[in-house]
């Protein structure tokens, strides 16, 4: 259940897709990735207020218990609901290869 | 890649499965669930230090970018890697039914 997409905290404050520009050095990949030199990393960032983009029943439970026991149970967290694949040109033992990674870039986000 | 399971913050401080006892009232379910009266909710709680139980490449990227830009990029978050099903006896329009929920109880945890 993808619950409400309306953010009660104000525009852009709740869980959503952000793009962060990162070099191979930033990512710690310079020793094994040849290309691209820079990646537009899409990731899920933002708050998860009550029922906002709740991924499932577990997220709804977490919201309820966080309200009751905020010191014990954390609020739901903004994480990828799905991913976009990306190809990297990388060094291998035998030379160079073009490799697809399926779990690198967030495609959309939910709270869990 | 499920990276290191050793918690550098000390025993039990990192992302792991916890059990939280909750009544139907706590969960906000009293109006539609008849049984059980109480649920042992298993959920994922704890810190996600560098590479601890990293779910995938995206989690590794998040760790690297959080280190560089802690105000912009949050640390990975402790969430369910899989779920255990649970049956609830619930009220319906026509009476009572026994219903299985697949996404209610966390089975194990990872950082993402």
């Amino acid at each position: 259940a993808r619950n409400g997409d309306h953010c009660p905290l104000g525009p852009g404050r709740c869980c959503r897709l952000h793009t962060v520009r990162a070099s191979l050095e930033d990512l710690g990949w310079a020793d094994w990735v040849l290309s691209p030199r820079e990646v537009q990393v899409t990731m899920c960032i933002g708050a998860c207020p009550s029922q906002f983009r709740a991924a499932n029943m577990h997220a709804q439970i977490k919201t309820s218990l966080h309200r009751l026991k905020p010191d014990t149970v954390p609020a739901p967290c903004c994480v990828p609901a799905s991913y976009n694949p990306m190809v990297l040109i990388q060094k291998t033992d035998t030379g160079v290869s073009l490799q697809t990674y399926d779990d690198l870039l967030a495609k959309d986000c939910h709270c869990i | 890649a499920r990276n290191g399971d050793h918690c550098p913050l000390g025993p039990g401080r990192c992302c792991r499965l916890h059990t939280v006892r909750a009544s139907l009232e706590d969960l906000g379910w009293a109006d539609w669930v008849l049984s059980p009266r109480e649920v042992q909710v298993t959920m994922c709680i704890g810190a996600c230090p560098s590479q601890f139980r990293a779910a995938n490449m995206h989690a590794q990227i998040k760790t690297s970018l959080h280190r560089l830009k802690p105000d912009t990029v949050p640390a990975p978050c402790c969430v369910p890697a899989s779920y255990n099903p649970m049956v609830l006896i619930q009220k319906t329009d026509t009476g009572v039914s026994l219903q299985t929920y697949d996404d209610l109880l966390a089975k194990d945890c990872h950082c993402i």
């Epitope: 040849l34 290309s35 537009q40 976009n84 190809v87 160079v96 290869s97 073009l98 | -």
Partner: antibody, heavy 121, light 107 residues
Framework: QVQLVQSGAEVKKPGASVKVSCKAS????????ISWVRQAPGQGLEWMGW????????FYAQKLQGRVTMTTDTSTSTAYMELRSLRSDDTAVYYC??????????????WGQGTLVTVSS | DIQMTQSPSSVSASVGDRVTITCRAS??????LAWYQQKPGKAPKLLIY???SLQSGVPSRFSGSGSGTDFTLTISSLQPEDFATYYC?????????FGGGTKVEIK
């Protein structure tokens, strides 16, 4: 604007070598790789290989392995492709192409004008 | 190596016609496919990348679709300047490979 300018046509004898240059302008040369593609008369496109303009790491098509060398000179933003032990079936137009790489994958978004290499005794 | 098979190898069409060219990969390549147009004596020109993304400056009558093994390039309304040879290219794994080409000729 991005431009790739290649060296002029060459006529070579069988067994000789040829070195084709490709001078890039209009972008940061080391940010993208260069691919080389050839096209025999009346035939389709054949990818020869790729070079990282940043690290100079290469991948060569298997059928050319041992005969081809791709290099770059970052000081002049120029890529080079040398083909040795030329045979008559190496007669082709040789193209360099900027190999753009980002989250949408790879594509050859700018091409040189082509260099005709004729191998004939 | 991944083989790319284009069909038809040639097609005769008139200005205003809708033209569809297909490309099949010998194994799954996700959406890592590009399309190029080449006119006689000229270098190829990028039209479509990532299977369906239109390269900047390319007219919107060109579109691409497909993923996995089967891909399509469509020219919605053929223009005089579109008579050329079209190539698909997989960029899923090295070695990069091209299809054999489809020549679009005037009927």
């Amino acid at each position: 604007q991005v431009q790739l300018v290649q060296s002029g046509a060459e006529v070579k004898k069988p067994g000789a070598s040829v070195k084709v240059s490709c001078k890039a302008s209009g972008y940061t040369f080391t940010n993208e790789g260069i691919s080389w593609v050839r096209q025999a008369p009346g035939q389709g496109l054949e990818w020869m290989g790729w070079i990282s303009a940043y690290t100079a790491d290469t991948f060569y098509a298997q059928k050319l392995q041992g005969r081809v060398t791709m290099t770059t000179d970052t000081s002049t933003s120029t890529a080079y492709m040398e083909l040795r032990s030329l045979r008559s079936d190496d007669t082709a137009v040789y193209y360099c192409a900027r190999t753009r790489h980002d989250t949408s994958g790879l594509r050859f978004d700018y091409w040189g004008q082509g260099t005709l290499v004729t191998v004939s005794s | 190596d991944i083989q790319m098979t284009q069909s038809p190898s040639s097609v005769s069409a008139s200005v205003g016609d809708r033209v569809t060219i297909t490309c099949r990969a010998s194994q799954g390549i996700d959406s890592w496919l590009a399309w190029y147009q080449q006119k006689p004596g000229k270098a190829p020109k990028l039209l479509i990348y990532a299977a369906s993304s239109l390269q900047s400056g390319v007219p919107s009558r060109f579109s691409g679709s497909g993923s996995g093994t089967d891909f399509t390039l469509t020219i919605s309304s053929l223009q005089p300047e579109d008579f050329a040879t079209y190539y698909c290219q997989q960029v899923h794994s090295f070695p990069i490979t091209f299809g054999g080409g489809t020549k679009v000729e005037i009927k």
